[in-house]
């Protein structure tokens, strides 16, 4: 079990998909919309999980994802039989400092070139996605086809 160095603050980044849509917070829901003037895309807060020994290896870097400065984190939970993506009021550093991984808030971050995917740790095979139509909420999907976009561009701010 490698001991990760303790980090005091999460990294910050911006996200857009291959259609240059950005993530915007609307009524406590994240939606993907084309970038426009006077628009305020969310800044993502992300931090690696300190406890990787109980998580699958070689699936990606397990990270917590939040909205910077808003005390909101992305999590996956079942509604009925369907895994869904939700925003929960949670301090990302509280998750990071736990003595155990909190799988429902964790995502395997994989990078291929400039593209990033975010796979749910709690529901393997389910990825953060946006509908190809745009203006739609972020979702979790198993279907990695044309209907949904699961590839995102992640730009680290600092």
């Amino acid at each position: 079990m490698e001991k990760a160095l303790k980090i005091d603050t999460p990294q910050q980044g911006s996200i857009q998909d291959i259609n240059h849509r950005v993530w915007v917070l609307q009524d406590q829901t994240l939606i993907a919309v084309p970038r426009k003037d006077r628009m305020s895309p969310v800044t993502i807060a992300l931090i690696s999980c300190r406890h990787v020994e109980t998580l699958e290896k070689d699936r990606g870097n397990p990270i917590y994802l939040g909205l910077n400065g808003l005390n909101l984190c992305l999590m996956c939970a079942k509604v009925g039989d369907q895994p869904t993506l939700q925003l929960k009021e949670k301090d990302i550093m509280d998750l990071y400092n736990q003595p155990e991984p909190v799988k429902s808030f964790l995502f395997y971050h994989s990078q291929s070139g400039r593209n990033s995917t975010f796979e749910s740790v709690a529901f393997p095979g389910w990825f953060i996605a946006v509908s190809s139509e745009g203006g739609c909420p972020l979702i979790l999907t198993q279907e990695l086809g044309k209907a949904n976009t699961t590839d995102f561009g992640l730009t680290m701010l600092f």
Epitope: M1, E2, K3, K6, E53, T54, D94, L95, N97, Q98, P99, E100, P101, V102, K103, S104, A122
Partner: antibody, heavy 121, light 111 residues
């Protein structure tokens, strides 16, 4: 066979600091995969996790006790220790040390025999 | 009041089957955390009995079995024997409280 043995005073006065040491034999406290923990059990009651430590020095404490607890490790002696300050009668309990093994969540797979600490003047 | 709820006591005659339940919530067992079980014989330290919901450490008889569903778990003991008389504790982790949590314990009496 891994063995853990608690040692320390059996009687502590109110407001003083409780100090216990756990000596590990039959295995190395410096194993990368394990944490080492303290759990207590008041007489006739259930179990309460106090905190855990990794040989690297990383510690996790029960938030309800965090302001009073310090756990440290001495890899050269294969020991880890507990200090609990400002004790009251409510801290009277059998104190156990245990190995904390990887699982989801972690599991206490080897336990010491326990030592009764009474807080009384 | 324990975060994980167990019945205070259960009983059974030798040879019978008994079950002990452990009920949690969405921030512990329901969040996907496994449940571990410990046996504490009178006057002794707890001993790991079941880990990861259903796995037995070496030396634990297959009369002991565990299961988990949703926000609860259970321990089953078949072919009850006099030496099974003990306190049994379930354990998991609660991410809201940030603590390893134990059930209040269940005293098993073999009649």
């Amino acid at each position: 066979q891994l063995q853990l043995q608690e040692s320390g005073p059996g009687l502590v006065k109110p407001s003083e600091t409780l100090s216990l040491t756990c000596t590990v034999s039959g295995g190395s406290i410096g194993s990368r995969s394990y944490y080492w923990g303290w759990i207590r059990q008041p007489p006739g009651k259930g179990l309460e996790w106090i905190g855990s430590i990794h040989y690297s020095g990383t510690t996790y404490y029960n938030p309800s006790l965090k302001s009073r607890v310090t756990i440290s490790v001495d890899t050269s002696k294969n020991q880890f220790s507990l200090k609990l300050s400002s004790v009251t009668a409510a801290d009277t309990a059998v104190y156990y040390c245990a190995r904390v093994a990887p699982s989801y969540p972690r599991v206490f797979d080897y336990w010491g025999q326990g030592t009764l600490v009474t807080v009384s003047s | 009041q324990s975060v994980l709820t167990q019945p205070p006591s259960v009983s059974g005659a030798p040879g019978q089957r008994v079950t002990i339940s452990c009920t949690g919530s969405s921030s512990n067992i329901g969040a996907g955390y496994d449940v571990h079980w410990y046996q504490q014989l009178p006057g002794t330290a707890p001993k790991l009995l079941i880990y990861g919901n259903r796995n037995r450490p070496s030396g634990v008889p297959d009369r002991f079995s565990g299961s988990k569903s949703g926000t609860s778990a259970s321990l089953a003991i078949t072919g009850l024997q006099a030496e099974d008389e003990a306190d049994y504790y379930c354990q998991s982790y609660d991410y809201s409280l940030r603590v390893y949590v134990f059930g209040g314990g269940t005293k098993l009496t073999v009649l």
